[in-house]
C-alpha cells in the first residue's frame, strides 16, 4: 500500500490526532457504536473499522480531523493487505504446523483469555 | 462455551499434543496448506482453522490424535465466541474512542509491522 510514511509512523501520528480531536469526536453524545468487550483487538478489526465509518459519517470534516480519518483508512488498507496474506502461500504440513504451534504459543502467553 | 477445562489449560494441552503427534501429522508430504506470511496471528484465525480442517481430513484418527483435533475444535469455538463479542455492545462514542486508542496503541507497540 503506497503511503507517504511507513505504517508504524502512520499509527503514531493517528494516535496523536485521535487525542487532538477527541473533544470534537465525542460531541455527538447520542451515537451508538459497537465496542468489543475483550482486548483481543485483532479479532475485531472489522467492527472497529465499521465503527470508524459510523463516526466519520457523523463528524463535520475539514482540517486535521480529515487527516485523522484518512490515516485510519490507510491503516485499514494495511490490515486488509495483511489479511490477504493469511492465505496466499500454500506450503508443506511442516510449515503449517510451525505456524500453528506459534499461534497457540502466542495464544498461551499473550492473549487475554477469560475463564 | 462449556469445556471441561479452562481455555488456557486447553491451549497448553493442545501444544503438548501437537508436539507428540508431529511425526504422524507430517507423514503426508504432498499435502499443501495455506500458511500466513506474517506473525499477526489473530488476523488469520479463519485460514488457520481451515488448514486444521484440511489436515484433520487427511489424518488417520484414533487415540490422542483425535483428542488433539477435538481440542482445536474447542479452541475454534472459543475464538468464534470472542469474535461474536466484537459487536454485541453498542456504546457511546467515548467508549469506542477508548477502545480505538487502545487498539492503535497495541498496534504501535506489539504488532509486527512491515515497512
Amino acid at each position: 500500500i503506497p503511503t507517504e510514511i511507513p505504517t508504524s509512523a502512520l499509527v503514531k501520528e493517528t494516535l496523536a490526532l485521535l487525542s487532538t480531536h477527541r473533544t470534537l469526536l465525542i460531541a455527538n453524545e447520542t451515537l451508538r457504536i459497537p465496542v468489543p468487550v475483550h482486548k483481543n483487538h485483532q479479532l475485531c478489526t472489522e467492527e472497529i473499522f465499521q465503527g470508524i465509518g459510523t463516526l466519520e459519517s457523523q463528524t463535520v470534516q475539514g482540517g486535521t480531523v480529515e487527516r485523522l480519518f484518512k490515516n485510519l483508512s490507510l491503516i485499514k488498507k494495511y490490515i486488509d493487505g495483511q489479511k490477504k496474506k493469511c492465505g496466499e502461500e500454500r506450503r508443506r504440513v511442516n510449515q503449517f504446523l510451525d505456524y500453528l504451534q506459534e499461534f497457540l504459543g502466542v495464544m498461551n502467553t499473550e492473549w487475554i483469555i477469560e475463564s | 462455551i462449556p469445556t471441561e477445562i479452562p481455555t488456557s489449560a486447553l491451549v497448553k494441552e493442545t501444544l503438548a499434543l501437537l508436539s507428540t503427534h508431529r511425526t504422524l501429522l507430517i507423514a503426508n508430504e504432498t499435502l499443501r496448506i495455506p500458511v500466513p506470511v506474517h506473525k499477526n496471528h489473530q488476523l488469520c484465525t479463519e485460514e488457520i482453522f481451515q488448514g486444521i480442517g484440511t489436515l484433520e481430513s487427511q489424518t488417520v484418527q484414533g487415540g490422542t490424535v483425535e483428542r488433539l483435533f477435538k481440542n482445536l475444535s474447542l479452541i475454534k469455538k472459543y475464538i468464534d465466541g470472542q469474535k461474536k463479542k466484537c459487536g454485541e455492545e453498542r456504546r457511546r462514542v467515548n467508549q469506542f474512542l477508548d477502545y480505538l486508542q487502545e487498539f492503535l496503541g497495541v498496534m504501535n507497540t506489539e504488532w509486527i509491522i512491515e515497512s
Epitope: T30, L31, V37, G53 | G87
Partner: antibody, heavy 111, light 105 residues
Framework: PGLVAPSQSLSITCTVS????????VHWVRQPPGKGLEWLGV???????DYNSALMSRLSISKDNSKSQVFLKLNSLRTDDTAMYYC?????????????WGQGTTLTVSS | SSLSVSAGEKVTMSCKSS????????????LAWYQQKPGQPPKLLIY???TRESGVPDRFTGSGSGTDFTLTISSVQAEDLAVYYC?????????FGSGTELEIK
C-alpha cells in the same frame, strides 16, 4: 418500595434466573400511570453502564453477577418519578431486543 | 393515538423518527416494536425493524427504513387488544414512541 416520600431514594433489585448476567445485558424502563414507556438505563454484560441523560445525575445501575441480581438506585425522588419500574433482558446481539420483562415494581412518590 | 378495527381486518400503525435509524454501513435499521396488554409488561414483537421475535404469530410484520416504519397486523384477533410501542435502537437514549392503542370493535 411502594410509597416513598419526595427527596428520598429508591432502590430496586431485579433477580434473574435461567441466564447469566455475564452474557446478557439488563435495561430498566419505567411507565407512569396511564402513560407511555421511558427508557432509564442499561447495565451491559461487560459491566459498563449507559443512562438516559435526563436522569443521569440521579440514577445508578449496578449488578452482582454471582447472585444474578441487578440493582437500580434513583436519588432525590420527585412526584413525577411515580411509575411502574421494569427490568428487561437484552440478549447478546448488536440489535436491541428486550425479550423478557419483569412484572414490574410500583413506586408512588408522595408526601 | 388509537385505532379501532374489527376482528379479521388488516391494520397498520406507523412510527416516524426525527432522525434516520438506518446504519448505512451495515444496512441495518435499528428499531423494535412491543405490544403491551392491559396490566402486563411489554412484549417484544419485532426487532431490527423487520425481524419477528420467535413465538410471535406471523400475522405481525415490521417494515420500513430510515425514518418511516410500519407495524402491520394482517388479520386482527381479539387478543391483539393492546398498546403498541416502537423503540429507537439507533442512538441514546432508547426512546419509545408515544404508543398506538388498538381497540377491537
Amino acid at each position: 418500595p411502594g410509597l416513598v416520600a419526595p427527596s428520598q431514594s429508591l432502590s430496586i433489585t431485579c433477580t434473574v434466573s435461567g441466564f447469566s448476567l455475564t452474557s446478557y445485558s439488563v435495561h430498566w424502563v419505567r411507565q407512569p400511570p396511564g402513560k407511555g414507556l421511558e427508557w432509564l438505563g442499561v447495565i451491559w454484560a461487560s459491566g459498563g453502564t449507559d443512562y438516559n441523560s435526563a436522569l443521569m445525575s440521579r440514577l445508578s445501575i449496578s449488578k452482582d453477577n454471582s447472585k444474578s441480581q441487578v440493582f437500580l438506585k434513583l436519588n432525590s425522588l420527585r412526584t413525577d418519578d411515580t411509575a411502574m419500574y421494569y427490568c428487561a433482558r437484552d440478549p447478546p446481539s448488536s440489535l436491541l431486543r428486550l425479550d423478557y420483562w419483569g412484572q414490574g415494581t410500583t413506586l408512588t412518590v408522595s408526601s | 393515538s388509537s385505532l379501532s378495527v374489527s376482528a379479521g381486518e388488516k391494520v397498520t400503525m406507523s412510527c416516524k423518527s426525527s432522525q434516520s435509524l438506518l446504519n448505512s454501513g451495515n444496512q441495518k435499521n435499528y428499531l423494535a416494536w412491543y405490544q403491551q396488554k392491559p396490566g402486563q409488561p411489554p412484549k417484544l414483537l419485532i426487532y431490527g425493524a423487520s425481524t419477528r421475535e420467535s413465538g410471535v404469530p406471523d400475522r405481525f410484520t415490521g417494515s420500513g427504513s430510515g425514518t418511516d416504519f410500519t407495524l402491520t397486523i394482517s388479520s386482527v384477533q381479539a387478543e391483539d387488544l393492546a398498546v403498541y410501542y416502537c423503540q429507537n435502537d439507533h442512538s441514546f437514549p432508547f426512546t419509545f414512541g408515544s404508543g398506538t392503542e388498538l381497540e377491537i370493535k
